[in-house]
Interface confidence: medium
């Protein structure tokens, strides 16, 4: 299963399968995921270690037990890959590091006026992998300014120093925010020249263009096919480089495919995983365990459930089958690639499904619609549960906001229907960041089913909760993801670090603002709450949140979006945005629906529509 | 490596008062709740309540409120459970813990009340 | 509250016996269990968890199963080190809730 605790002051001894530098454990645990065999990971942060060399050190494990012996280490970090981890998989890491400089090969100096624009430059072009910034008050005048775009043979600096007054961070192509755009094509019968940076086997193109996008250096690829003339060269899957970004040459050739990586990609990425079955074919590698199962969808289950499995045999030969049962033959290597494939067997093989993102991991005015005052833009992916509600009549505009929980399941608030209870004239729009994005082109939901709470009452703020049913499921990407549902009872108050968001007036007397945008807003005990609004009952089942003075809160346009708690370590949805009277008054705060007092009920109408529980729960 | 050192051990008389710390190590004190749990041989382990250092904000079994306080002092990394009105029901094993997600996963070495005339 | 109630509340078993401490509460708690090996004189050590599974570096010999209201922690070959009482826990509703204990020995 996922396992995401992390052991601090940890260290696990032994297993080593390799070794880098990160900035920190988190960028450490991304690479521990990305690995084929890695299991476990220790990182070494500045403070914990005197070694110089040692210093961010992240040494990635594996264990056939799944787990190692802990010792301790003060400072240190450990923890597990977040492989079978569903949504939480994801190469993208956002982060900018303050103090630190992170080394590499320097290819391309330039001045900018601050450290976003050098990340930016650095995700707009094609080799960047990190970068290094000296800002204004660097100890040397003429590095002022300076942005160094950076790579390296493996993706992750050759080493990482302290440096006062330098600013570091990754390129931000892998959470799809690339300007650079990409090649879907697949060119037939063309190899591409330059430099190899690896070489694997993969039953199609698919997989070598997969593969290529996740590979730290890979920017095109060739591909030599099943009936390639020269026997060892089949199903050959060559990663390339070059100088410039793009295959210095091409040539026509019989049997090889060619295209290039996904990675700069904008907005959509491939899954990190291979899914299709190939029937037919034989996948060699070193043999984990084999197991009798029926049929071989069942076969690729117990492979991705087994979170060594790396690939998996189904073998229809009559010695290998058992009534309906046959074998299931468990494979792993050290690439994560099958060591030898073989067509025209009676087997059928595929791919472990562990690095998938869409996993359901069960282990994210006066009382009339309530914007966010006094925030600030959000970035792309920093709430992907977030989504739009929009109305279409004679126009489409925004009515309120809703937070995805599950592939099919939407949270809001019951308000947002009031007189307008049509499913079909809804259209909900997850995965963006600006209003102004949206076209008529732009994907959206449509709604199979609204579940406004039984006891809700129009004009009355009393169980402002609704669930959306989603006419089809959506997949999770690194915009479009659900947010964690508090347990049942959970008591606000002990809730810090929380956050609304939503698209919703800016001011009273605002209008809909098209960035998405997010406030820190503290939560107010109810007995505070009720002072504040002496004409309404503040029931148990809903919680505030504002400032004393006023100036941060939702508006009109944010009803049925999210208040977001980091609660021990994970983002559990609190509250949906209700009401309030007026906006960000002084002693007025916004009035929430409380999730977790609403919990029976979700999972209730959630497993009872479709015989199975498909909300978020906290993993 | 996460640590909770408790304070040690209380022979009370009945209607004291008792003050038991919890020294927090190894993590961000003000991000994580501090639960404690209280054990005796007959009704065995009993969820007293939580104390988020980061807010000040709590939570309270109803059976424990106004038998239980929390507090918790930021700068030296403490939390306390101070238990009043002492009977000889009171006399157990409280322990400070500390979750990852909502499971405990962290936890004091105890520490043993006795409520004795 | 949410009653938890396991058994059996004391067993003994021979080192290598497949050893089974069932865990029911009094209504669904949606998979929120939590189990914990505590062993004389020690505090509590939380083994599984319904959210991430098996902790780590608890012996692979640990599993957790069941759904709904009723729960199983399973010792698939008992060892002398596993001498100690076991307690589940629902994190479901507050407030959280304990079973009884079941004391396991070696015969």
């Known amino acids: 299963g996922c396992l995401t605790q992390l052991y601090e002051n940890a260290f696990f001894r032994g297993g080593d399968v390799a070794s880098m530098y990160t900035p920190n454990a988190q960028y450490c645990q991304m690479r521990c995921t990305f690995h084929p065999r890695c299991l476990l990971f220790s990182f070494l942060p500045a403070s914990s270690i005197n070694d110089m060399e040692k210093r961010f050190g992240c040494f990635l494990k594996d264990s056939v037990t799944g787990t190692l012996p802990k010792v301790h280490r003060t400072g240190a970090v450990s923890g597990h890959s977040l492989k079978q981890c569903g949504h939480q998989i994801s190469a993208c890491h956002r982060d900018i590091y303050k103090g630190v400089d992170m080394r590499g090969v320097n290819f391309n100096v330039s001045k900018v006026s601050s450290v976003e624009e050098c990340q930016k430059r650095c995700t707009s072009n094609i080799r960047c992998q990190f970068f290094s910034y000296a800002t204004q008050t660097f100890h040397k005048a003429e590095y002022r300014n300076n942005c160094l775009l950076k790579y390296s043979p493996g993706g992750t600096p050759t080493a990482i120093k302290v440096l006062s007054n330098v600013e570091s961070g990754f390129s931000l192509k892998p959470c799809a925010l690339s300007e650079i755009g990409c090649h879907m094509n697949i060119f037939q019968h063309l190899a591409f020249s330059d430099v190899d940076v690896a070489r694997v086997l993969t039953p199609d193109a698919f997989v070598c263009r997969t593969i290529c996008t996740y590979h730290p250096n890979c920017l095109f690829f060739t591909f030599y096919t099943n009936v390639w003339k020269i026997e060892s060269q089949r199903n050959v899957c060559l990663l390339k480089t070059s100088e410039s970004g793009t295959p210095s040459s091409s040539t026509p050739q019989e049997n090889t495919i060619s295209g290039y990586s996904l990675l700069t990609c904008k907005r959509t990425l491939p899954e990190p995983c291979h899914s299709k079955i190939y029937p037919g074919v034989d996948f060699g590698g070193e043999e984990l365990n084999v197991t009798f199962v029926k049929g071989v969808n069942v076969c690729q289950e117990t492979c991705t459930k087994m979170i060594r499995c790396q690939f998996f045999t189904y073998s229809l030969l009559p010695e290998d089958c058992k009534e309906e049962k046959c074998k299931c033959f468990l494979r792993l290597s050290m690439d994560g690639s099958p060591t030898r494939i073989a067509y025209g067997t009676q087997g059928s093989s595929g791919y472990s499904l562990r690095l998938c993102n869409t996993g359901d991991n069960s282990v994210c005015t006066t009382k009339t619609s309530t914007r966010i005052v006094g925030g600030t833009n959000s970035s792309w992916g920093e709430w992907p549960w977030q989504v739009s509600l929009q109305v279409k009549l004679t126009a489409q505009r925004h009515l309120c906001g809703g937070s995805l929980i599950g592939h099919q399941w939407v949270l809001t608030a019951a308000h947002c229907f009031d007189g307008l209870p049509l499913q079909d004239v809804w259209r909900i729009y997850s995965g963006i960041l600006n209003l102004s994005d949206i076209t008529k082109d732009t994907p959206f939901s449509q709604i199979k089913e609204i579940i406004i709470h039984q006891n809700y009452k129009v004009s009355e703020g009393n169980h402002d909760i609704a669930l959306i049913k989603l006419q089809a499921p959506l997949n999770y990407t690194e915009f479009q993801k659900p947010i964690c549902l508090p347990s049942k009872g959970d008591t606000s108050t002990i809730y810090t670090n929380c956050w609304v968001t939503g698209w919703g007036f800016s001011k009273e007397k605002g209008e809909i603002q098209n960035i998405l945008q997010k406030v820190n807003i503290p939560l107010v005990t109810n007995e505070e709450c009720q002072k504040r609004y002496q004409d309404y009952k503040i029931t148990q089942r809903m919680v505030c949140a504002g400032y004393k003075e006023g100036g941060k809160d939702a508006c009109k346009g944010d009803s049925g979006g999210p208040l977001v708690c980091k609660h021990n370590g994970m983002w559990r949805l609190v509250g949906i945005t209700s009401w309030g009277e007026g906006c960000a008054r002084r002693e007025q705060p916004g009035v929430y629906t409380k999730v977790a007092e609403y919990m029976d009920w979700i999972l209730e109408k959630t497993q009872s529509s479709d015989g199975k529980a498909q909300m978020q729960s906290p993993a | 490596q996460v640590q909770l050192q408790q304070s040690g051990a209380e022979l009370m008389r009945p209607g004291a008062s008792v003050k038991v710390s919890c020294k927090a190590l190894g993590y961000t004190f003000t991000d994580y709740e501090m639960h404690w749990v209280k054990q005796t041989p007959v009704l065995g382990l009993e969820w007293i309540g939580a104390?988020?250092?980061?807010?000040?904000?709590?939570a309270y079994n109803q059976k424990f409120k106004g038998k239980a306080i929390f507090t918790a002092d930021k700068s030296s990394r403490t939390a306390y459970m101070y238990l009043s009105s002492l009977t000889s029901e009171d006399s157990a094993v409280y322990y400070c813990t500390r979750p990852y997600g909502y499971p405990f996963a962290y936890w004091g070495q105890g520490t043993l009340v006795t409520v004795s005339a | 509250d949410i009653q938890m109630t396991q058994s059996p509340s004391s067993l003994s078993a021979s080192v290598g016996d497949r050893v089974t401490i069932t865990c029911k509460a009094s209504e669904d708690i949606y998979n929120r269990l939590a189990w914990y090996q505590q062993k004389p004189g020690k505090a509590p050590k939380l083994l599984i968890s319904g959210e991430t599974g098996l902790e780590a570096g608890v012996p692979s010999r640990f599993s957790g199963s069941g759904s709904g209201t009723d729960f199983t922690l399973t010792i698939s070959s008992l060892q002398p080190e596993d001498v100690a009482t076991y307690y589940c826990q629902q994190y479901w509703s507050t407030p959280w809730t304990f079973g009884q204990g079941t004391k396991v020995e070696i015969k």
């Open positions: 104390i988020h250092p980061g807010s000040g904000g709590t």
